[in-house]
């Protein structure tokens, strides 16, 4: 069976600054040189693309300049960081990996990481 398995943590809690990081790991059935990683958000049965990046093995992940995602790669592992998260962004974040080149193409989709985001309490006014 030449399928591609993608693993990611079940739950991640975003920091008070609205930053969440998780690892997306894939078991490559072939020797890919070009990989595309997409983060999908699923909430209320709606699916939206959060960000996507294509990278050459051994090189850094490059997301678009206006992307809320950053990441680094090491072998078959991608370390993803999503920034600017607010409580309304709580949801299931799914890692989708595609081995683009060389042929054959392979698709792998993780089970998703539930990211919980809690908006920080506003600081109380002080007399100081």
């Amino acid at each position: 069976c030449k399928a591609m398995h993608v693993a990611q943590p079940a739950v991640v809690l975003a920091s008070s600054r609205g930053i969440a990081s998780f690892v997306c790991e894939y078991a490559s059935p072939g020797k890919a040189t070009e990989v595309r990683v997409t983060v999908l958000r699923q909430a209320d049965s709606q699916v939206t693309e959060v960000c996507a990046a294509t990278y050459m093995m051994g090189n850094e992940l490059t997301f678009l300049d206006d992307s809320i995602c950053t990441g680094t790669s090491s072998g078959n592992q991608v370390n993803l960081t999503i920034q600017g998260l607010r409580a309304m962004d709580t949801g299931l974040y799914i890692c989708k990996v595609e081995l683009m080149y060389p042929p054959p193409y392979y698709l792998g989709i993780g089970n998703g990481t539930q990211i919980y985001v809690i908006d920080p309490e506003p600081c109380p006014d002080s007399d100081f």
């Epitope: 069976c1 399928a3 591609m4 059935p29 999908l40 294509t54 683009m100 193409y105 698709l107 792998g108």
Partner: antibody, heavy 118, light 106 residues
Framework: QVQLVESGGGVVQPGRSLRLSCAAS????????THWVRQAPGKGLEWVAV????????YYADSVKGRFTISRDNSKNTLYLQMNSLRAEDTAIYYC???????????WGQGTMVTVSS | EIVLTQSPGTLSLSPGERATLSCRAS?????LAWYQQKPGQAPRLLIY???SRATGIPDRFSGSGSGTDFTLTISRLEPEDFAVYYC?????????FGQGTKVEIK
């Protein structure tokens, strides 16, 4: 709304060429891989080709490799299929289809008929 | 290349009956979809990931299975369900379809 509309089909002689187009609307075209699938009269579905995202990666079915070329113009939200050295067995309805977020073909065009006959 | 074999070729049933369609793969597949096609129309995605219903698909359609054996079930056939159904694997290239099962009115 989200849709794909094919055009360019027609009757052509064996050995000649034809170019099909597929106009996309209602979604961010450059974020999706797009396929061509064909269906010979009274037959089943046959995958033909795919082009991914920015157009740098393309895959073809063995039956069309070396004769057909898939391309896309993201600025025009349009997919193309250049068909050369056409054969009678290429006669079919040609559909373009979007590979959705999960990979399955979630949006299809209405199809355009290509008839290769002398 | 993964070969998908659908059975039966034709299924003759009456409205209200249950339809069970089979799709068998020549090797294990991770990603399988089901499509419905009516005469003169383009295919329509019903099920992806073997068991997830596509947007807007009625819950009388359900998919199950894993590995090499997959099933599409239509719990109660409506008049508009009489059509040809195709399975497809999409987890690796080349993408392949089954030969189709025709569900016709008995």
């Amino acid at each position: 709304q989200v849709q794909l509309v094919e055009s360019g089909g027609g009757v052509v002689q064996p050995g000649r060429s034809l170019r099909l187009s597929c106009a996309a609307s209602g979604f961010t075209f450059s974020s999706y891989g797009t396929h061509w699938v064909r269906q010979a009269p009274g037959k089943g579905l046959e995958w033909v080709a795919v082009i991914w995202y920015d157009g740098s990666n393309k895959y073809y079915a063995d039956s069309v490799k070396g004769r057909f070329t898939i391309s896309r113009d993201n600025s025009k939200n349009t997919l193309y299929l250049q068909m050369n050295s056409l054969r009678a067995e290429d006669t079919a309805i040609y559909y373009c289809a979007r590979a959705g977020n999960w990979g399955a073909f979630d949006i299809w065009g209405q199809g355009t008929m290509v008839t290769v006959s002398s | 290349e993964i070969v998908l074999t659908q059975s039966p070729g034709t299924l003759s049933l009456s409205p209200g009956e249950r339809a069970t369609l089979s799709c068998r793969a020549s090797q294990s597949v991770s990603y399988l979809a089901w499509y419905q096609q009516k005469p003169g129309q383009a295919p329509r995605l019903l099920i992806y990931g073997a068991s997830s219903r596509a947007t807007g698909i009625p819950d009388r359609f359900s998919g199950s299975g894993s590995g090499t054996d997959f099933t599409l079930t239509i719990s109660r056939l409506e008049p508009e369900d009489f059509a040809v159904y195709y399975c497809q694997h999409y987890g690796s290239s080349p993408w392949t379809f089954g030969q189709g099962t025709k569900v016709e009115i008995k």
